[in-house]
Interface confidence: low
């Protein structure tokens, strides 16, 4: 049962797993969490009658009913964790803490102007944790605008404390606000030489680096693979860090792999997300159940419906055993990783989806695409929508993009002469437009955001955001698509496909089912020589092919160019502009998302 | 086939009023833009007014005495043309299109255009 609401003057007794500092019963709750194990906490907040020292503490704890006696007491607050909530979670907290220093390693010092500027700077330094910064009124004089940058073995402060005019709070990088690089490659072959802050056992290289990933201190990993020769070491996942943050050695060895924290990319990657089965590998943690089930799916789901199930191992029914059903072990662990994997025993193994919810919807993988024609098939490209103007009369305006439950990206031209959100409507789900009849529902718009620096879409600044007045229920034909990570700048993609129910030539009309063309991503510097007579800046990014012949074209506009990387989605991508449709050596001209993730963000995330 | 067919042009002295009648075929949706667009002998051809999503918009030198309509559910467009001008001789051309605004009403833009009716102003 899902219960968010805090309890007041309110403490569960017992079941402690261990103690945390938090600045607020909030964040108390979302480090719970995250906590592998943690289903209900009390956090103490400060009170006159409470001892200072246990002031900001966060007791995480378990209970095998999943829940504890209550007691009343004053200045504590209760609840539950997040994990029996089917709702997405963030670990983003963008609070700013007056008054409070949270204590951690101070590794940074250094002047900042602001604790906006402090808070940046502790964002895009891949140590830090969290910040204190001294105001200018701070009464030491030297201390003044002093920017602390901090970390902890835990992510958490050691300690947190009341002083007078400071202010603290955490890194963004949770928030995809970081414009540190996200390196996605792993690297075979490949032992980091570095310090290991801590080791876990791993079915593979990716789900040890999505563990490193959300563990707070490590940087980068190296996983032996279970060929590995020492046997007491395979499958083991090493979590490490260096002072620099960059592996300072690099060791060939065989059936060795490693790879770096996604942590700058972890908005537009699964992370938590570990979905993939494991044959003939047997899990081995501390036993919560023994069910029935009649496959290793369905094993899954009675893990992935049970909150303290971790991960599991199925083994198939004996021929003619158990109305062939076979056994589910459902299993957890300290760490919510196996103490042990073993190979050859005939199980099928995998880990709980309930951690799914804490990745980016966007990141879910979609049915497989038809390739090659141009008509689209229903649920390929469910981030599609269709913007529909109703004054004078109904009719298609423009395409968009889903990429949150309340938010449409698509391009600022496409309002021009649109006075009032009210005459627009968003259908999502949509793959013919003689679908849309008089009693099909739509999404209102309750806000138009158009970028302040747009004046024409040939000078760039062609996006906008309009804010839907009711929420997206995400289905197989209508759920977001990833923004890319500012980390990915210097990705090259070469799986992209622009979509729309536009023009398929200059003198065409608007097209019933939705279209497909994949194209070539074009340099700016080529595009550049095409249009001799334009700016192509780097906020725009240019796709065609050199004969011409594929292009997006009217009635496209604002609709996405949706590129592949490792097996993501991501929106690269604003039709924008174009001379012609489809001419040779005349690419199509697109708003360059990853230069305006931080006003998508802003604009999104604003309170 | 998208067909534009105007009609309504002819003769008429200065001061005069005539109304011109758009009419498209061939086409699904309604357009988001339709245009009046006139051509004089020997000159280019010029904007003279359009309607895009139900907002007007018009060249300065027929302000006040042209107005542009438009009627969806029969797809048409009109234009009424009062306190005509000898200036405003020329043959009028309707244009229509699922034009998103590109900085300029009067660009080339348009993919549809009609055959055009001659409208002459004597003094």
């Known amino acids: 049962e899902c219960v968010t609401q805090l309890l007041k003057d309110t403490c569960f007794e017992g079941g402690d797993i261990t103690t945390v500092f938090t600045p607020s019963a909030k964040y108390c709750q979302v480090v719970c969490t995250y906590h592998p194990r943690c289903l209900l906490f009390t956090f103490t907040a400060e009170s006159p009658s409470e001892d200072p020292t246990r002031w900001f503490t966060c007791v995480l704890k378990d209970s095998v009913t999943e829940t504890l006696p209550r007691v009343n007491r004053t200045a504590a607050i209760s609840g539950y964790s997040f994990k029996q909530c089917s709702h997405q979670i963030s670990a983003c907290n963008k609070d700013i803490y007056v008054d409070l220093d949270m204590k951690g390693i101070n590794y940074n010092s250094s002047v900042a102007k602001s604790a906006q500027e402090c808070q940046e700077r502790c964002t895009d330094d891949v140590h830090c944790h969290f910040f204190t910064y001294a105001t200018r009124q701070f009464p030491s004089l030297e201390h003044r605008n002093i920017c602390l940058l901090k970390h902890t073995q835990t992510g958490t402060p050691t300690r947190i404390t009341k002083l007078d005019k400071v202010v603290s709070g955490f890194s963004l990088k949770s928030c995809a606000l970081s414009n540190l690089a996200c390196i996605r490659d792993i690297f075979p072959n490949t032992v980091f030489a570095d310090s290991n802050i801590d080791s876990v056992m791993a079915p593979d290289a990716f789900v040890c680096g999505r563990i490193c990933t959300h563990h707070p201190g490590c940087l980068f990993f190296t996983f032996f693979s279970q060929e590995w020769p020492k046997e007491s070491q395979r499958n083991l996942c090493l979590l490490k860090t260096s002072e620099s943050g960059l592996p300072s050695t690099r060791i060939k060895k065989s059936k060795a792999l490693s790879g770096f924290s996604l942590q700058s990319c972890r908005h537009s990657i699964p992370v938590f997300c570990h979905s993939s089965f494991y044959h003939d590998t047997d899990f081995l943690g501390e036993e919560l159940d023994i069910v029935a089930a009649k496959s290793h799916e369905a094993c899954q789901k009675l893990c992935t419906n049970a909150v303290r199930c971790q991960f599991f191992t199925y083994t198939p029914a004996q021929a003619s055993c158990n109305e062939g059903k076979g056994k589910c072990y459902l299993k957890l662990s300290s760490n919510g990783s196996p103490t042990k994997i073993l190979h050859g025993r005939g199980g099928i193994s995998g880990y709980t989806l309930r951690l799914c919810k804490m990745d980016n919807e966007c990141t879910t993988k979609i049915k497989p695409r038809i390739v090659g024609g141009t008509a689209s098939v229903r649920g390929e490209w469910p981030w599609q929508v269709t913007l529909h103007t109703t004054s004078p009369t109904q009719r298609h305006l423009c395409g968009g993009s889903i990429i949150g439950n309340q938010w449409i990206l698509t391009a600022a031209h496409c309002f021009y002469g649109v006075e009032s959100p009210k005459i627009l409507r968003v259908y999502s789900g949509i793959l013919n437009q003689s679908e849309i009849k008089e009693d099909t529902s739509f999404f209102g718009v309750q806000e138009i955001i158009i970028h302040d620096q747009y004046k024409m879409a040939e000078s760039g600044y062609d996006i906008a955001l309009l804010k839907l007045e009711t929420t997206v229920n995400y289905t197989d034909s209508q759920r977001p698509i990833c923004l890319p990570s500012k980390g990915d700048r210097n990705v090259i993609y070469t799986d992209c496909w622009v979509t729309g129910w536009g023009y398929r030539k200059l003198r065409d009309k608007i097209q019933n089912t939705l279209q497909k063309a994949k194209i070539p991503l074009v340099t700016n510097e080529e595009c550049q020589k095409r249009y001799r007579g334009h700016k192509i800046t780097h906020k725009m990014i240019c796709a065609g092919y050199r004969e011409g012949g594929k292009d997006a074209c009217k009635g496209d506009s604002g609709g996405p160019l949706s590129c592949k990387h490792n097996e993501v989605w991501h929106l690269v991508g604003i039709t924008s502009w174009g001379e012609g449709c489809a001419q040779r050596e005349r690419p199509g001209v697109y708003t360059n998302v990853v230069e305006y993730v931080d006003w998508i963000l802003e604009k999104t995330q604003a309170v | 086939q998208v067909q534009l067919q105007e009609s309504g042009g002819g003769s008429v002295q200065a001061g005069g009023s005539l109304r011109l009648s758009c009419a498209a075929s061939g086409y699904t949706y309604s357009f988001n833009s339709m245009g009046w667009f006139r051509q004089a002998p020997g000159k280019e051809r010029e904007g003279v007014a359009v309607?895009?999503?139900?907002?007007?918009h018009y060249a300065d030198s027929v302000k006040g005495r042209f107005t542009i309509s438009q009627d969806n559910a029969k797809n048409m467009v009109y234009l009424q043309m009062n306190s005509l001008k000898p200036e405003d001789t020329a043959m009028y051309y309707c244009?229509?299109?699922?034009?998103?605004?590109?900085?300029?009403?009067?660009?080339?833009?348009?993919?549809?255009w009609g055959q055009g009716t001659q409208v002459t102003v004597s003094s």
């Open positions: 244009a229509a299109d699922l034009l998103e605004y590109d900085g300029t009403w009067f660009g080339s833009t348009y993919n549809y």
């Open positions: 309607i895009y999503l139900g907002s007007t």
